[in-house]
């Protein structure tokens, strides 16, 4: 026998209290698939998060980060502070890359300059905190 709830589309829930009729999701909630017996609470983009896409009755809100921060984790579950190029984020804040390392992005860690001699090459352009070395012939 077919479950009557399977007829309830996204944006509704199957109301067991009312002979399994399809009732619309309450405001600030959604159901992204049919046949659900409850709706899900919409994500709230607050604080350092900002709304990239509003919640609808059929899809959750999507958040990104305010300027000066970038997303981390699935679905932007966290916001991490940006640093300048040539820096990395530590527990004490943004710190310049140590000599011999670089970071060409606003996120991530400082990485060692390429060792040109490993490939039998010489340094064509010296590295900086922001840029890797350029190896020559």
């Amino acid at each position: 026998l077919q479950d009557p709830c399977s007829n309830c589309p996204a944006g509704t829930f199957c109301d067991n209290n009312r002979n399994q009729i399809c009732s619309p999701c309450p405001p600030n909630s959604f159901s992204s698939a049919g046949g659900q017996r409850t709706c899900d609470i919409c994500r709230q983009c607050k604080g350092v998060f900002r709304t990239r896409k509003e919640c609808s009755s059929t899809s959750n809100a999507e958040c990104d980060c305010t300027p000066g921060f970038h997303c981390l984790g699935a679905g932007c579950s966290m916001c991490e502070q940006d640093c300048k190029q040539g820096q990395e984020l530590t527990k004490k804040g943004c710190k310049d890359c140590c000599f011999g390392t670089f970071n060409d992005q606003k996120r991530g860690i400082c990485r060692p300059w390429t060792n040109c001699s490993l490939d039998g090459k010489s340094v064509l352009v010296n590295g900086t905190k922001e840029r890797d070395v350029v190896c020559g012939p």
Epitope: S23, P26, N28, D40
Partner: nanobody, 122 residues
């Protein structure tokens, strides 16, 4: 026992106004997320307006924004819906409803009253 009793419906001409009331007993309106749903003839339920503590906001359906105003009187444990500039498409049975948050994050709503019929016609 939880009860919600809607009143204030009736026949009104297009452009007219009505105020619906919902008197609650068995629970405290001010401690709940509550609102109004309606069912037009031959149609499904539609959320009209709600006061949402979870979202920290007042919700209005696009079709009623700027025309309907939801409010509550905590002392009287009563919810109101002030409706103005009424249109034929607002004709429906209006029910007072309570949003229910379930363990595990699910959301549904309850409504118990018989509703109050609003007919907009000339």
């Amino acid at each position: 026992e939880v009860q919600l009793l809607e009143s204030g419906g009736g026949l009104v001409q297009p452009g007219g106004s009505l105020r619906l009331s919902c008197a609650a007993s068995g629970f405290t309106l001010s401690a709940e997320d509550v609102g109004w749903v309606r069912q037009a003839p031959g149609k499904g339920l539609e959320w009209v307006s709600a006061i949402l503590d979870f979202g920290g906001s007042t919700y209005y359906a696009e079709s009623v924004k700027g025309r309907f105003t939801i409010s509550r009187d905590n002392a009287k444990n009563t919810l109101y819906l002030q409706m103005s500039s009424l249109r034929a498409e607002d004709t429906a049975v209006y029910y007072c409803a309570r949003v229910v948050y379930h363990a595990g994050g699910g959301v549904t709503f309850d409504y118990w009253g018989q509703g109050t019929l609003v007919t907009v016609s000339s």
